[in-house]
C-alpha cells in the first residue's frame, strides 16, 4: 500500500525520500515519476539525478533538499487536482536487483475558503502526514503532529528551512532513510 501525503490546491506539495550516501559525494542515481514504481525506472519520469547532479527535470518539480547528502525529497509547485495520484521515488543502487523503490500517494484537496485571506492552513509541509517504515508487508505508518497555522509571507521560506528543521530529522528517524554501503 502507498504512503499518503496531502496538500491543497495552489500550494506546494512535499514528498519525502531519503538515502544515506556511502561516502560524501558518492551519489546514487535517483528518479521520480508519476505513477506507481514499475519494475524498472519511474513510470513517467519527472525528475532525475545522476552521480553528480540533477540532470533532468520538468517544470514545477524540483529537489529543495540537499540531494548531495541524500535528501531527494520532491517538491511539486502550485499543485492542482490533476497532481493527485501515486508518485515513485526510486534509488537506483548499482548491482544486481538492488534498487529501492517507494510509492507515495499524493492527495490534493480543494483550497479552503476562509474568511481571513492572510492565513492558510495545510501548506504542503503541513501534517498529519504518513510515513512508511521499510519492510515487505503492508506499510506501517506513523503520524506526525500538525504544524501551526502559517502566514502567507512565511510560505516561501518554509520549504528552504524544512531540510534543516527537526521535521527533516523526524523523517529520517522514522525509517524513511536508506543507508548505502
Amino acid at each position: 500500500s502507498e504512503v499518503e501525503y496531502r496538500a491543497e490546491v495552489g500550494q506546494n506539495a512535499y514528498l519525502p525520500c531519503f538515502y544515506t550516501p556511502a561516502a560524501p559525494g558518492n551519489l546514487v542515481p535517483v528518479c521520480w515519476g508519476k505513477g506507481a514504481c514499475p519494475v524498472f525506472e519511474c513510470g513517467n519520469v519527472v525528475l532525475r539525478t545522476d552521480e553528480r547532479d540533477v540532470n533532468y527535470w520538468t517544470s514545477r518539480y524540483w529537489l529543495n533538499g540537499d540531494f548531495r547528502k541524500g535528501d531527494v525529497s520532491l517538491t511539486i509547485e502550485n499543485v492542482t487536482l490533476a497532481d493527485s495520484g501515486i508518485y515513485c521515488c526510486r534509488i537506483q543502487i548499482p548491482g544486481i536487483m538492488n534498487d529501492e523503490k517507494f510509492n507515495l500517494k499524493l492527495v490534493i484537496k480543494p483550497a479552503k475558503v476562509t474568511p481571513a485571506p492572510t492565513r492558510q492552513r495545510d501548506f504542503t509541509a503541513a501534517f498529519p502526514r504518513m510515513l512508511t517504515t521499510r519492510g515487505h508487508g503492508p506499510a506501517e505508518t506513523q503520524t506526525l503532529g500538525s504544524l501551526p497555522d502559517i502566514n502567507l509571507t512565511q510560505i516561501s521560506t518554509l520549504a528552504n528551512e524544512l531540510r534543516d528543521s527537526r521535521l527533516a530529522n523526524d523523517l529520517r528517524d522514522s525509517g524513511a532513510t536508506i543507508r548505502i554501503g
Epitope: 537506483q92 548491482g95 536487483m97
Partner: antibody, heavy 122, light 107 residues
Framework: EVQLVESGGGLVQPGGSLRLSCAAS????????MAWVRQAPGKGLEWVAN????????YYLDSLKSRFTISRDNAKNSLYLQMNSLRAEDTAVYYC???????????????WGQGTLVTVSS | DIQMTQSPSSLSASVGDRVTITCRAS??????LAWYQQKPGKAPKLLVY???TLAEGVPSRFSGSGSGTDFTLTISSLQPEDFATYYC?????????FGQGTKLEIK
C-alpha cells in the same frame, strides 16, 4: 530503422558455455534498458534478464542469475548474454529486446531481434 | 512472482469477428501491461503497452483496456493476418512475467 540482430547461438553440450551477442542500430542505444527473452520450442515466452542504460544495474530471473550474466558495450551498441553451466532446459530461441527508455513512459518490449537458437544436448 | 493468466488458451474465429482475449494478474500491476502478437517462426511484435496505448504502426482494430488485475485485448474485426498467438506481459514486478499465450485460429 531500429534493428536488433542476435548471434552466437548454436549446439553446446550440457555444462558448456555460450556467449550471445546482439548488435543494435537505428536508435540511441545508451538511452534504453535492454533485455533477453527466451522461448523453448513449442512453449511460451520467458524473460531472462534486463540491464540498465550504462550496465551498472542488472536484473535476472532468479533461477538463472548464478549462471547467466547480461552486459552491454555502449561504444559498440552491443548487448551480451554470457551463459555458463548450460542445461538441456536452457534450449530455446533467445531474443534480444529493447525495453523502457530514459524518460520512462513506454513499458513494453517495443523492438525484438529475430532470435538465435541455443541447443543444449549431448 | 506475479502470475499472468490468459483466457482462453485457444480460440477459433472467422474473418470479421470481434474477439476479446483476457489477462488476469495475480497482484495489482496498475497499468504496466503489454500485449504481443507472435506468428510461427517469428519474433513477437508489440501491440499495446501501458495497458491501452497502441504501439506505433499497429492497426486501430486492436485495442487494450483494464488496470489493476484485469485486462483485455480486443480485435474489433478480425483480418486474415491476425491469426497468431497473443501474449500479455507485466512490467510491474520482478521477474517480468508473460501469460501462457492465446492461440487464435481460423474457424
Amino acid at each position: 530503422e531500429v534493428q536488433l540482430v542476435e548471434s552466437g547461438g548454436g549446439l553446446v553440450q550440457p555444462g558448456g558455455s555460450l556467449r550471445l551477442s546482439c548488435a543494435a542500430s537505428g536508435f540511441t542505444f545508451s538511452d534504453y534498458y535492454m533485455a533477453w527473452v527466451r522461448q523453448a520450442p513449442g512453449k511460451g515466452l520467458e524473460w531472462v534478464a534486463n540491464i540498465n542504460y550504462d550496465g551498472s544495474s542488472t536484473y535476472y530471473l532468479d533461477s538463472l542469475k548464478s549462471r547467466f550474466t547480461i552486459s552491454r558495450d555502449n561504444a559498440k551498441n552491443s548487448l551480451y548474454l554470457q551463459m555458463n553451466s548450460l542445461r538441456a532446459e536452457d534450449t530455446a530461441v533467445y531474443y534480444c529486446a529493447r525495453d523502457v527508455g530514459y524518460y520512462g513512459g513506454n513499458y513494453g518490449f517495443a523492438y525484438w531481434g529475430q532470435g538465435t537458437l541455443v541447443t543444449v544436448s549431448s | 512472482d506475479i502470475q499472468m493468466t490468459q483466457s482462453p488458451s485457444s480460440l477459433s474465429a472467422s474473418v470479421g469477428d470481434r474477439v476479446t482475449i483476457t489477462c488476469r494478474a495475480s497482484d495489482n500491476i496498475y497499468s504496466y501491461l503489454a500485449w504481443y502478437q507472435q506468428k510461427p517462426g517469428k519474433a513477437p511484435k508489440l501491440l499495446v503497452y501501458n495497458a491501452k496505448t497502441l504501439a506505433e504502426g499497429v492497426p486501430s482494430r486492436f485495442s487494450g483496456s483494464g488496470s489493476g488485475t484485469d485486462f483485455t485485448l480486443t480485435i474489433s474485426s478480425l483480418q486474415p493476418e491476425d491469426f497468431a498467438t497473443y501474449y500479455c506481459q507485466q512490467h510491474y514486478g520482478s521477474p517480468l512475467t508473460f501469460g501462457q499465450g492465446t492461440k487464435l485460429e481460423i474457424k
